[in-house]
Interface confidence: low
């Protein structure tokens, strides 16, 4: 008779990424007998929750339960019922909630209270909802991509082809861009990390890593746009803002009260003689780039070298995975190919931003106008942040790999977060050789 595989002995885990603009639920799966091996956990499902980020629910906390229902029900379907009770669920909220907490601890806690109550109603092993720090967000993103790339393993990987493979075990740096913050994390080469706040020490699979990380709150793409608008409206002579970061012919009315709602624009706040202003796009990449650069204070640095705003940044080292909005925006602009040079990216951005709004709307009829209108800004912002903010150059640009998924798992902090909380990253190399993927009798 033919050999039959024994029933799969697998485990599941759920992580909700409560970002500033939306919430996503990720389901992970791994062979139970290989928990401590590197690279065996993989994503089986991503469910994007319909609606905004949880920080937008301050005025309607009672709607949070319904908001989370569809994705939690999806998790119920995907994970076998027999596994429900032992499947951990974690919710990590990022910069959107950090900003809300800056405005009001009470409001942030109220939102988290309701989130916790809602998630506790499901048959899973709910482990809590919390606002993760920027340092954690950076660190877990770095762990995720290096785990998926097999960088922590001294053994042959169980999967066949690793994308972006280099011949050595040097880890990749991680570049993460969200709506409200951006993180840069990497192992510097023989460089003292001059600022203790930016230093992390890990021992993973028997090897020590001295990691640099920083999270720039308010420098995610959405908050950076609010900052830029708040800065530019200061010098507008009337309620018309001619903006080079939007396509020619684009028009949008912005409420001043919305502009000053976020703590990110506080430094630009002033009494304006109008309640609303109108953005009128003029679509000029170079001027947009110049306007964005004014958000980065590079005149002050208390260390040997800085990124911006006086934040220490060691010399860049090795290859980097750029994910989340770095990837989504560049993918939309068709600029993720390894073959596209930085000069080519700049050239393409100049052309894209100069295209009339009516033409853009026709070319991308299926894309929501709110998102479509902001790709010129977002693409320009990514270039400005990487080149002037983090000091990548035209030649080090080729070391940036825009990554959406690695081996079917999304690049981002959630997998690293779960691996850590479920103790699946051992400090030392596991002694025994793990069993093969499935055992036959």
């Amino acid at each position: 008779t033919q050999n039959k595989a024994l029933p799969e002995n697998v485990k599941y885990g759920i992580v909700l990424d409560a970002g500033s603009s939306h919430t996503s639920l990720y389901i992970y799966k791994w062979p139970a007998e290989k928990e401590n091996d590197t690279g065996v956990v993989h994503q089986v499902e991503e469910c994007r929750v319909a609606g905004p980020g949880i920080s937008k629910f301050v005025q309607k906390v009672n709607a949070i339960g319904i908001y989370l229902t569809a994705c939690m029900e999806r998790a119920r379907e995907v994970i076998p019922r027999s596994q429900h009770q032992e499947t951990p669920v974690y919710l990590g909220a990022t910069a959107g909630m950090r900003l809300l907490r800056m405005e009001s601890e009470e409001l942030a806690d109220r939102v988290l209270d309701v989130v916790e109550r809602s998630l506790s109603n499901y048959p899973f092993d709910f482990q809590g909802a919390r606002i993760i720090t920027g340092q954690e967000e950076g660190a877990y993103g770095w762990i995720t991509i290096n785990y998926l790339l097999g960088k922590f393993s001294q053994k042959t990987r169980w999967f066949s082809i690793v994308p972006y493979e280099t011949n050595n075990q040097e880890t990749f740096g991680a570049l993460d861009l969200g709506g409200a913050s951006t993180q840069v994390t990497f192992v510097p080469q023989n460089q003292t990390i001059e600022s203790p706040d930016n230093a992390l020490q890990f021992r993973l699979y028997g090897k020590d890593y001295n990691v640099y990380t920083h999270s720039f709150l308010c420098y995610g793409k959405d908050q950076a746009l609010w900052q830029k608008l708040a800065k530019d409206i200061q010098v507008a002579s009337n309620e018309i803002l001619r903006d080079p970061c939007f396509h020619p012919g684009y028009k949008k009315v912005v409420n001043v009260s919305d502009l000053y709602k976020t703590p990110c624009t506080k430094r630009f706040e002033m009494t304006l003689p109008f309640q609303q202003f109108e953005i009128q796009g003029i679509g000029n990449y170079q001027q947009c780039h110049q306007s964005i650069l004014e958000l980065f204070n590079t005149s002050y640095c208390p260390y040997s070298q800085c990124a911006f705003n006086g934040i220490f940044l060691p010399p860049l080292q090795g290859d980097f995975g750029a994910f989340s909005a770095f990837y989504f925006v560049m993918k939309f602009l068709n600029l993720t190919s390894e073959k596209v040079s930085q000069e080519k990216v700049t050239e393409m951005m100049k052309k894209f931003c100069a295209q009339p709004w009516e033409e853009i709307k026709t070319s991308y009829a299926g894309v929501k106008e709110k998102y479509l209108s902001e790709y010129c800004f977002s693409g320009t912002y990514i270039l400005s942040l990487l080149l002037q903010g983090y000091h990548f150059t035209a030649d080090s640009w080729e070391h940036i790999h825009f990554i959406g998924k690695i081996q079917g798992s999304d690049a981002g902090w959630t997998l690293g977060y779960m691996l850590n909380l479920t103790n699946m990253i051992p400090a030392e190399q596991p002694l025994s050789t793990p069993l093969s993927h499935s055992t036959y009798v």
């Epitope: 301050v58 005025q59 009001s104 601890e105 009470e106 409001l107 942030a108 806690d109 109220r110 209270d113 919390r130 606002i131 720090t133 706040d197």
Partner: antibody, heavy 116, light 111 residues
Framework: EVQLQQSGPELVKPGASVRMSCKAS????????MHWVKKNHGKGLEWIGY????????TYNQKFKGKATLTVNTSSKTAYMELRSLTSEDSAVYYC?????????WGQGTLVTVSA | NIVLTQSPASLAVSLGQRATISCRAS??????????MYWFQQKPGQPPKLLIY???TQGSGVPARFSGSGSGTDFSLNIHPMEEDDTAMYFC?????????FGSGTKLEIK
């Protein structure tokens, strides 16, 4: 279980300074701001300010600016408050209390007595 | 600063009866549809204990006989039925804006 353990009573002379501590356990220290409250007989409870353990950022009641300095040591999960240029007006019980919705967790208080 | 005026300054209530303490704010403590008003109980030699948050939500482990109500500028704490263990000082507090402020307190005793 959330616990905030405060340092013992202090008897200090006018003009001197005092530093008290508040050691946290039972929760992730950096997830919550630490607030300080003064309790004296004449004026009831007064909020002094808070510190964000993530970055050491502080927010003070204007009344206590220059009087109180808040600091933290994240590795030992301890918050500190230093009071300077003490006068008899500063004789009181000082509480640390964890931030977030509702000050549900309080230290037992540190009694400061200013006397020549 | 938001000033909280608490009344009465002291109150004596018979066991089993209702005690009502009021707190008036000099300006609204509502934000995003939530009232940032809190009620604390404090006994001699002990730290304050949270009874009510967000004007009407009971704190963890607080007996059902404690209830809070109100919005905007006018709030009240009700204790019914009064028990011997409820003898204490009661404070209202707002955390809508910095500086957070407390009421001057109400001393509750048994008649």
């Amino acid at each position: 279980e959330v616990q905030l353990q405060q340092s013992g009573p202090e008897l200090v002379k006018p003009g001197a300074s005092v530093r008290m501590s508040c050691k946290a356990s039972g929760y992730t220290f950096t997830d919550y701001n630490m607030h300080w409250v003064k309790k004296n007989h004449g004026k009831g409870l007064e909020w002094i300010g808070y510190i964000n353990p993530n970055n050491g950022g502080t927010t003070y009641n204007q009344k206590f600016k220059g009087k109180a300095t808040l600091t933290v040591n994240t590795s030992s999960k301890t918050a500190y408050m230093e009071l300077r240029s003490l006068t008899s007006e500063d004789s009181a019980v000082y509480y640390c209390t964890r931030g977030g919705t509702r000050f549900a967790s309080w230290g037992q208080g540190t009694l400061v007595t200013v006397s020549a | 600063n938001i000033v909280l005026t608490q009344s009465p300054a002291s109150l004596a209530v018979s066991l089993g009866q209702r005690a009502t303490i009021s707190c008036r704010a000099s300006e609204s403590v509502d934000n995003y549809g939530i009232s940032f008003m809190y009620w604390f109980q404090q006994k001699p030699g002990q730290p304050p204990k949270l009874l009510i948050y967000a004007a009407s939500t009971q704190g963890s482990g607080v007996p059902a006989r404690f209830s809070g109500s109100g919005s905007g500028t006018d709030f009240s704490l009700n204790i019914h039925p009064m028990e011997e263990d409820d003898t204490a000082m009661y404070f209202c507090q707002q955390s809508k804006e910095v500086p957070f402020t407390f009421g001057s307190g109400t001393k509750l005793e048994i008649k």
